[in-house]
């Protein structure tokens, strides 16, 4: 707390300038009136005032403002919102995009603070959504920030912000996540025709069911060995090698040097190995001539 | 973390001139703003000139003409500050400080070096 003093003669602050940064931290408390730096917060950015001098102006606008800044004052925060906690932010009503952008500026190219979590949490449930506009920012900002939310957050992303959605910015989403996320991607891109679907829906087909990879099979769609790495093992395990090899196109060749790793080793454990001869890769463990396989699991949904 | 070390200081007469530097080592990439303070005996410490870090420069009444802060971000010595027609009573311990972004923001200071003006 800064202790109450009268302001100097001659030194009360008729605005906010470049001269403020002289004054020592008692001076700006008793020299600088809240309702003056309200209205011009947006000088406060181009002011290279010390931390300690932030602190102090920012104690002046929660004195003022004790339920919460207005958004006039939010949007031009500026350096001053790396002064503000989490609890404060919670005290914030954010509907504005400009706003939200000009905030996610100031901490540009460093890493997501709570702050920073605080601030989005607050504007994504004012808005009710993650909107195209909202999702299009902040994976501009933060490329990860889709796959820091949790499947239910997921699931009021509607299908039209999927277009706002760049590859790398699915990179670090895990299979619960991809789940919700593919169909909603699969609805987004629906009247494309094929290649051009393909391209867009790849990122997402580590959420993808087998009858739609088994769909993807019958379009020449080339997949990649990465892609083709990231499907539910589930999704995978149920496809034949004729499948597979169309699937995957000049890539199927890949196969080998993924042999050991899943999905592929768990899958080439349920085809017969006559069927992975046909492909003349070498592959090893299938099932082999002549053994009955028994599906266990149909049985007992049949039970 | 910051690192930042000042030299140049020394004895000189009055009206003369001395340049003093600030090496910074660390994080110097998360540099904002950058300050010469000093600190007279028996004296507060008072901010003399800032430059911020967009390059604009910041002087306290008492220097305004006679001293020049600058800044070189492409080298480790970062902050200089140069000081022609000096008085006695520039006499102090000149302390380079720097700020980083980031939460929460933090001030980083050097040890000072001392310039002594008299005849």
């Known amino acids: 707390e800064v202790e109450k003093t009268a302001c100097p003669s001659g030194k009360k602050a008729r605005e906010i300038d470049e001269s403020l940064i002289f004054y020592k931290k008692w001076e700006l408390e008793a020299c600088v009136d809240a309702a003056l730096l309200a209205t011009q917060m947006d000088r406060v950015n181009a002011i290279p005032f010390t931390y300690e001098q932030l602190d102090v102006l920012k104690h002046k606008l929660d004195e003022l403002y004790p339920q919460g800044y207005p958004e006039s004052v939010i949007q031009h925060l500026g350096y001053l919102f790396l002064k503000m906690s989490p609890e404060d932010i919670r005290k914030w009503n954010v509907t504005s995009l400009e706003t939200l952008k000009a905030l996610l500026e100031v901490n540009k190219g460093h890493e997501m603070s709570p702050q920073v979590a605080t601030l989005i949490d607050r504007f994504v449930k004012g808005r009710g959504q993650l909107d195209k506009d909202t999702l299009d920012t902040l994976t501009a900002f933060y490329p990860g920030y889709l796959c820091s939310l949790s499947p239910e957050e997921l699931s009021s992303v509607p299908p039209s912000s999927i277009w706002a959605v760049r590859p790398q910015d699915l990179d670090t989403c895990d299979p619960r996540q991809l789940d919700v996320l593919y169909p909603k991607a699969r609805l987004a891109f629906q009247n494309m025709n094929g290649s051009e679907y393909f391209v867009k829906i790849q990122s997402f087909l580590g959420g993808a069911p087998t009858e739609d990879l088994k769909a993807l099979s019958q379009q020449n769609v080339s997949m990649d060995l990465a892609t083709f790495m990231k499907l539910r093992t589930d999704a995978v395990l149920p496809l034949t090698v004729a499948e597979v090899q169309k699937l995957l196109g000049p890539h199927v060749e890949g196969l080998k040097a993924e042999e050991r790793h899943r999905p592929v080793r768990d899958w080439i454990l349920r085809q017969r190995q006559d069927d992975l001869d046909t492909l003349g890769l070498g592959l090893q463990g299938g099932i082999p001539n002549g053994y009955l396989v028994l599906d266990l699991s149909m049985q007992e949904a049949l039970s | 973390q910051v690192q930042l070390v000042e030299s140049g200081g020394g004895l000189v007469q009055p009206g003369g001139s001395l340049r003093l530097s600030c090496a910074a080592s660390?994080?110097?990439?998360?540099?904002?703003?950058m300050r010469w303070y000093r600190q007279a005996p028996g004296k507060q410490r008072e901010l003399v000139a800032t430059v911020s870090n967009d390059g604009s420069a910041y002087y306290a009444g008492s220097v305004k003409g006679r001293f020049t802060i600058s800044r070189d971000n492409s080298k480790n010595t970062l902050l200089y500050l140069q000081m022609n027609s000096l008085r006695a009573e520039d006499t102090a311990v000149y302390i380079c400080?720097?700020?980083?972004?980031?939460?929460?923001?933090?001030?980083?200071w050097g040890q000072g070096t001392q310039v002594t003006v008299s005849s």
């Open positions: 400080n720097a700020d980083t972004w980031g939460w929460p923001g933090a001030d980083y």
């Open positions: 660390g994080s110097i990439s998360s540099i904002r703003h």
